[in-house]
């Protein structure tokens, strides 16, 4: 029997609403699926909270290249960081007696492949990125984002789903990985650690960052997520590392300031629309890319991961708010919600820039060890 942690004090709706909710690969649907409904049908079917203005209201494509003060991944020391002293976990889970093996969590039992066999696949995420081994691929052009600068209305749903904090994105946010590789954004969520313990999912030469943002996209070739799961390129995730910096990040504050309203698992609230692109690094031209999986059950493969080379800076207070506000099931804090890095198993991580070329005095003759396989080759 679990004791709810002051459940009465936190309304489900907060102050005013994934990789997270899995679908088994055996559930992949047939071709004749009907389109999903954005909103439940109402009698008068008023516009839902997620409804968006039409195309003519969307801002122009915003390729970013201007420099920011944030650290670049190739600037990191190449010294191997000490391994994490602990496995990622969700602390102090108290589950009901006789809990079956279908409910996954971070750390401990059950092993994820028992929850979803795809989690034992050969091409899983996250991975450790080693820039020196990345294949420079000039065909990887700057990412293009369209419609990511949202007006305050309609409001967006911010939800504590027990695994992360997730912001549901409205229709109309378009992203292109390149010509003919077009996607629409579905949601963003974060992964983090705990006090003094970093919690990014991807690592760089063994270095784990304080936190990581994932913006999850559905290929425009598919009408619904349930059609796209497990299909090559059906989903694409933009990932960026979050680091500590001297100043408050005003874009992130719009979300972090609302976390207390959704402290309990299952609670949600509405937040004004914001510039989603402001949550990402400004340099859309330098990134790493590889094919992997969802980082939570069902761990479906075929996901295109794009990991920005530039990081995003948050203040120490903001990082503390992120890691110390939310609760998972029962009386467990929602912390250390990252999966361990997975083996590449022969995959080559591509880079849109010559990441393997180290301009520091330590590398007299930098060599690119892997060659690029351009998209479509």
């Amino acid at each position: 029997q679990r004791l709810p942690r002051m459940q009465e004090d936190s309304p489900l709706g907060g102050g005013s609403s994934g990789e997270d909710d899995p679908l088994g690969e055996e559930d992949l649907p047939s071709e004749e699926d009907s389109p999903r409904e954005e909103d439940p049908p109402g009698e008068e079917d008023l516009p839902g909270e997620e409804d968006l203005p039409g195309e003519e209201d969307l801002p122009e494509v915003k390729p970013k290249s201007e420099e920011e003060g944030s650290l670049k991944l190739e600037d990191l020391p190449t010294v191997e960081a000490p391994g994490d002293p602990q496995e990622p976990q969700n602390n102090a889970h108290r589950d009901k007696e006789g809990d079956d093996q279908s409910h996954w969590r971070y750390g401990g039992d059950p092993p994820w492949p028992r929850v979803s066999p795809a989690c034992a696949g050969r091409f899983q995420s996250p991975v450790d990125i080693r820039p020196q081994l990345a294949a420079f691929c000039p065909a990887l052009r700057p990412l293009e984002l369209l419609g990511f600068q949202l007006p305050p209305l309609p409001e967006l749903r911010l939800r504590n789903n027990g695994h992360s904090v997730q912001l549901t994105l409205p229709p109309g946010l378009e992203m292109a990985l390149g010509p003919g590789r077009e996607y629409r954004a579905l949601q963003l969520h974060l992964h983090w650690g705990a006090a003094g313990r970093p919690g990014s999912e991807h690592t760089v030469e063994g270095h784990r960052f304080p936190a990581e943002i994932h913006v999850v996209h559905l290929s425009t070739a598919f009408a619904r997520v349930d059609e796209a799961l497990g299909r090559p390129g059906g989903l694409a995730v933009l990932a960026a590392f979050l680091e500590e910096g001297p100043e408050e990040n005003s874009a992130y504050e719009q979300l972090l300031s609302r976390l207390e309203e959704i402290a309990e698992e299952g609670s949600e609230t509405q937040v004004p629309g914001l510039d989603i692109s402001a949550l990402l690094p400004s340099d859309f031209s330098r990134y790493f890319q590889y094919e992997g999986s969802l980082t939570t059950p069902p761990c479906a493969q075929g996901v295109i991961w794009t990991v920005f080379n530039q990081t995003v800076m948050l203040s120490a207070k903001q990082l503390h708010t992120l890691s110390d506000t939310l609760w998972g099931p029962g009386d467990s804090r929602l912390q250390l919600n990252f999966r361990a890095t997975q083996p590449l198993n022969g995959r080559v991580i591509e880079a849109s820039f010559p990441a393997g070329v180290d301009s520091s005095p330590r590398a007299a003759e930098p060599v690119q060890l892997n060659s690029c396989l351009a998209a479509g080759d």
Epitope: D27, H103, G162, Q187
Partner: nanobody
Amino acid sequence: QVQLVESGGGLVKPGGSLRLSCAASGITFNLHAMRWYRRAPGKQRELVAYISARDWTNYADSVKGRFTISRDNAKNSLYLQMNSLRAEDTAVYYCNTDLVGEDYWGRGTLVTVSS
């Protein structure tokens, strides 16, 4: 294909009870958090109750102590037991889940509380 089908709505007097059901297909049901929402005429959609894959539950303040959400993973079914119903509970009730952040909804079942 993910499908959610609600049933159990109807006309009930104040103080009465109803039990709503939601049959799910096309998903590995026992891996999913599930939710009941409602939309009253002329009002915004409201989250009523939540149940995680681990059976952790959470409720809107307006229904705490009166409504109980539950699930039967063997039957791929979600339930909402509604007791001590009030006129303000009148609404269309929707079953909801999401896959990787994309919402899936049933068509709803109408609950009318009136004397």
